[in-house]
């Protein structure tokens, strides 16, 4: 089938990085500078994307692949192929319809993007809060309140000794 197709359509032999030049008897010509073809059998090459302004070049254009852009520092890509640059917030904030806003009490965000998430509810696991949460950090859960009752040891007993040469299961 491939052989039949190539007999019918000489352009199918043109590899990525070239185009089928109708002006030159359908010879495979290299893509001109600042253009590319990512698949074979193309009749034209696509113009390379230029990362200008707030967009910076993350990957240069080649004859077989388009350039890839990212955003100026303090901003991150949004949309297909980085069509927009969205601002980073501080840790402890989230991006809302009114811009970067502090996380509400009881929520946190340890990233510069994304949303504020509720603190872990330690009591659901029968544990107590060891370290309080902040806008930037989740709570740290500790032993269950029963484990901390008077007389109860909070020291972890030593692990049983292993025979030399045996790795843990």
């Amino acid at each position: 089938f491939e052989r039949t197709r190539s007999l019918q359509d000489p352009c199918s032999n043109c590899p990525a990085g070239t185009f089928c030049d109708n002006n030159r008897n359908q010879i495979c010509s290299p893509c001109p500078p600042n253009s590319f073809s990512s698949a074979g059998g193309q009749r034209t090459c696509d113009i390379c994307r230029q990362c200008k302004g707030v967009f910076r070049t993350r990957k240069e254009c080649s004859s077989t692949s388009n350039a890839e852009c990212d955003c100026t520092p303090g901003f991150h890509c949004l949309g297909a192929g980085c069509s927009m640059c969205e601002q980073d917030c501080k840790q402890g904030q989230e991006l809302t319809k009114k811009g970067c806003k502090d996380c509400c009490f009881g929520t946190f965000n340890d990233q510069k993007r994304g949303i504020c998430r509720p603190w872990t509810n330690c009591s659901l696991d029968g544990k107590s809060v060891l370290v309080n949460g902040t806008k930037e950090r989740d709570v740290v859960c500790g032993p269950s309140p029963a484990d901390l009752s008077p007389g109860a040891s909070s020291v972890t007993p030593p692990a049983p000794a292993r025979e030399p040469g045996h790795s843990p299961q």
């Epitope: 901003f75 640059c85 969205e86 970067c100 806003k101």
Partner: nanobody, 119 residues
Framework: EVQLVESGGGLVQPGESLRLSCAAS????????MLWWRQAPGKERELVAA???????YYTDSVKGRFTISRDNAKNTVYLQMNSLKPEDTAVYYC?????????????WGQGTQVTVSS
């Protein structure tokens, strides 16, 4: 609803300075990206400078080292300090505010202030 009012434009000679102000009212814009755009006659609107809520700044190549964008969240105001002005800086300067991104489709725009650099 945010309203933006620019001021500080005028006629100056090459090499002189101007400071543009953009006062926001109607809501606080401390969490917004604030931007200065300009449009010269017969040309496309061009992003000059931007400042994120965290304080990251962006400048177009032609103004780097000459222009400085800053914000005063307490006054709900953003500034553009323009030094060593050149005739090619002549344009109408627009302030814009967007809660999220740098885009020509910013949520809020001012009416613009004319800057003319001529000897």
């Amino acid at each position: 609803e945010v309203q933006l009012v620019e001021s500080g434009g005028g006629l100056v000679q090459p090499g002189e300075s101007l400071r543009l102000s953009c006062a926001a009212s109607g809501d606080t814009v401390s969490g917004y990206v604030m931007l200065w755009w300009r449009q010269a006659p017969g040309k496309e609107r061009e992003l000059v400078a931007a400042i994120s809520s965290v304080g990251y700044t962006y400048y177009t190549d032609s103004v780097k080292g000459r222009f400085t964008i800053s914000r005063d969240n307490a006054k709900n105001t953003v500034y553009l300090q323009m030094n060593s002005l050149k005739p090619e800086d002549t344009a109408v300067y627009y302030c814009a505010a967007d809660p999220a991104s740098i885009s020509t489709r910013s949520a809020y725009w001012g009416q613009g202030t004319q800057v003319t650099v001529s000897s």
